[in-house]
């Protein structure tokens, strides 16, 4: 080890290690946590502050409208009464109380954040960790959704409602247990030495956890995706030999990809950036993440809010569900759907049956 | 090797203003807080503030808010203090110092500045 | 703020002595202590932090206790380089306070 200074041979630079005993601070002050971590805790509303909180409740009213509207389609459209349905109104659920629990971070973000203990802290956080869980889980249960749609050769699964409530009380639960693991233990309240910066009374560990555990599910989704769309790939190009069709081929497998596009690209675009911060802020002591953080928190927020327009807004069904909703008409042919109903655009399941199973189209 | 290198002595006028600065080597500047502390002749260690590179984010003893402002150059790995509207008061060695440990705030320090003596006189 | 009181304010000892010093807070600062060794013209170097870790290439014979309020640094078979200004501070947050002081001579 260098000596510290030139003035003393005696003392040379030091080997900090953690406090020989074990101390909790749990009825510490956050300006405590935060002061230790070097984030700025601001003590009086600034420009930023001001226009972070002016578009975030803008996004959340957004999102809580949006998601409520998806919801209430797929609960007065008997047409949506089929698992990928039920899915998509659990993604909104899980998207209305990321708005939620966004709403709640805003009234306590800034200045206020000074006014919370340690528990209102925690419970702040965990419903943010638990919304985007719940999201994210959500995204993936989709996601494997479409993927057994596909290779069983369905236009619906055969999942039973049973085994969808199952799911969805899976996704629940595993959003519930995610974002209450630091409030039952793991933080550095008792760990002051491995705080982080950007959540100053969490664990370096568990921001590491968390942005690994996420960015897997991401790569898990292009996987299955990718898988997806190499089977239909490969099933388009052996039928265009066999029939006359091969247009509209190109244009399920342009349809297709589109629509992964979309909802890969969203995912990327507003998660990406987030976690790659929450890596960099443990695994890089030279970077300044906290100048970046609430935007990126904001973006992966609009992940939320870009949710019910790409699995639902894109669907001509979903839109004129909405239609109904926000014009309080009645539905017409609340039975099935009209021979000419374009669902396939969006609802990636009815893309490729569209093309691959080209006779199943009209089964629901 | 670990180092704080400080500017010399500054001899100033009552009312002016000066500006101190702390050139760290041999480890990475923004990974540590910087702290700079006042004493005077014959007596004890007074906290004035700190700077953390990383964040730009800084903390004052409110004895010295509006009396020092403290900044950082990460090009140059350079801690500044400047302090103005200089009294006889003001009269004094100030060290700077760094942090114990890095990417957080401990509030102690391990590494020290040789110090800069400040004297104001007319 | 919290404030410092060390004790005593000057202490005369001879070589192989054993010294304690002694620091006061204001308030709860559970095991925020640093000890800190001053000579002469020279830079202050942190001894203890945390109450009681020694500092990397600090002689064991130095040792530091006490949590909360109360807290000392125990120097034992004092050595030459030994003697100085030891001063004692919290490092809880900001803002940071130091102990007057305790110059510690040789007899």
């Known amino acids: 080890m260098a000596a510290a200074s030139t003035s003393s041979p005696v003392i040379s630079q030091p080997q900090f290690t953690a406090m020989n005993e074990q101390q909790c601070f749990y009825n510490e002050s956050i300006a405590f946590f935060y002061n230790r971590s070097g984030k700025y805790l601001a003590t009086e509303w600034n420009t930023v502050s001001k226009l972070v909180m002016g578009l975030g409740i803008t996004v959340c009213v957004f999102i809580m409208l949006a998601n409520l509207l998806v919801m209430v389609a797929i609960y007065v459209n008997r047409r949506f009464h089929f698992p990928i349905y039920y899915l998509m109104a659990n993604l909104a659920a899980a998207d209305f109380f990321a708005g939620l629990a966004y709403f709640y971070l805003m009234f306590n973000t800034g200045p206020n954040t000074r006014r919370l203990t340690v528990s209102t802290w925690l419970l702040r956080q965990g419903l943010i960790d638990t919304s985007l869980t719940a999201s994210v889980a959500n995204l993936l249960a989709i996601a494997i959704e479409r993927h057994i749609t596909v290779f069983r050769m369905q236009l619906h699964t055969r999942m039973s409602n049973r085994r969808v409530v199952v799911v969805i009380v899976v996704i629940w639960t595993m959003a519930i247990v995610m974002g209450a693991i630091p409030s039952v233990g793991w933080n550095c309240i008792c760990d002051i030495d491995h705080c982080s910066n950007m959540a100053p009374l969490y664990s370096d560990s568990y921001l590491v956890f968390w942005a690994i555990f996420n960015l897997v599910t991401f790569v898990v989704m292009v996987v299955l995706y990718a898988h997806i769309f190499g089977y239909v790939r490969q099933r388009t190009m052996r039928m265009s030999r066999h029939s006359s069709g091969p247009r509209r081929n190109r244009d399920t497998m342009m349809s297709l990809l589109k629509t992964v596009v979309i909802v890969l690209g969203a995912f990327i675009v507003c998660w990406t950036p987030g976690l790659v911060l929450l890596l960099l802020d443990v695994c890089c002591p030279q970077c300044d993440v906290l100048a970046y953080e609430k935007f990126f928190l904001l973006l992966a927020e609009f992940n939320s809010a870009m949710n019910p327009i790409i699995y639902s807004y894109r669907d001509k069904e979903m839109s004129a569900t909405f239609r109904q909703i926000l014009c309080c008409q009645r539905n017409e042919n609340p039975n099935g759907p009209t021979e000419g109903s374009d669902r396939s655009a969006s609802s990636l399941n009815h893309t490729i049956l569209a093309g691959v199973h080209s006779n199943d189209h009209s089964v629901v | 090797q670990v180092q704080l290198q400080q500017s010399g002595a500054e001899l100033a006028r009552p009312g002016a203003s000066v500006k101190l600065s702390c050139k760290a080597s041999g480890y990475t500047f923004t990974s540590y807080g910087i702290s700079w502390v006042k004493q005077r002749t014959g007596q004890g260690l007074e906290w004035i503030g700190e700077i953390y590179p990383r964040s730009g984010n800084t903390y004052y003893n409110e004895k010295f808010k509006g009396k020092a402002t403290l900044t950082a150059d990460k090009s140059s790995s350079t801690a500044y203090m400047e302090l103005r509207s200089l009294t006889s008061e003001d009269s004094a060695v100030y060290f700077c110092?760094?942090?114990?440990?890095?990417?957080?705030?401990?509030?102690?320090?391990?590494?020290w500045g040789t110090g800069t003596t400040v004297t104001v006189s007319s | 703020d919290i404030h410092m009181t060390q004790s005593p304010a000057s202490l005369s000892a001879s070589v192989g002595e054993t010294v304690t010093i002694t620091c006061r807070a204001s308030?709860?600062?559970?095991?925020?202590l640093a000890w800190y060794q001053q000579k002469q013209g020279k830079s202050p170097h942190l001894v203890v932090y945390n109450a009681k870790t020694l500092t990397e290439g600090v002689p064991s014979r130095f040792s530091g206790s006490g949590s909360g309020t109360h807290f000392s640094l125990k120097i034992n078979s004092l050595q030459p380089e030994d003697f100085g200004i030891y001063y004692c501070?919290?490092?809880?947050?900001?803002?940071?306070?130091f102990g007057a002081g305790t110059k510690l001579e040789l007899k």
């Open positions: 501070q919290h490092h809880y947050g900001p803002p940071l306070t």
């Open positions: 308030e709860n600062i559970y095991s925020f």
């Open positions: 110092a760094r942090e114990s440990i890095s990417r957080r705030l401990g509030w102690n320090f391990d590494v």
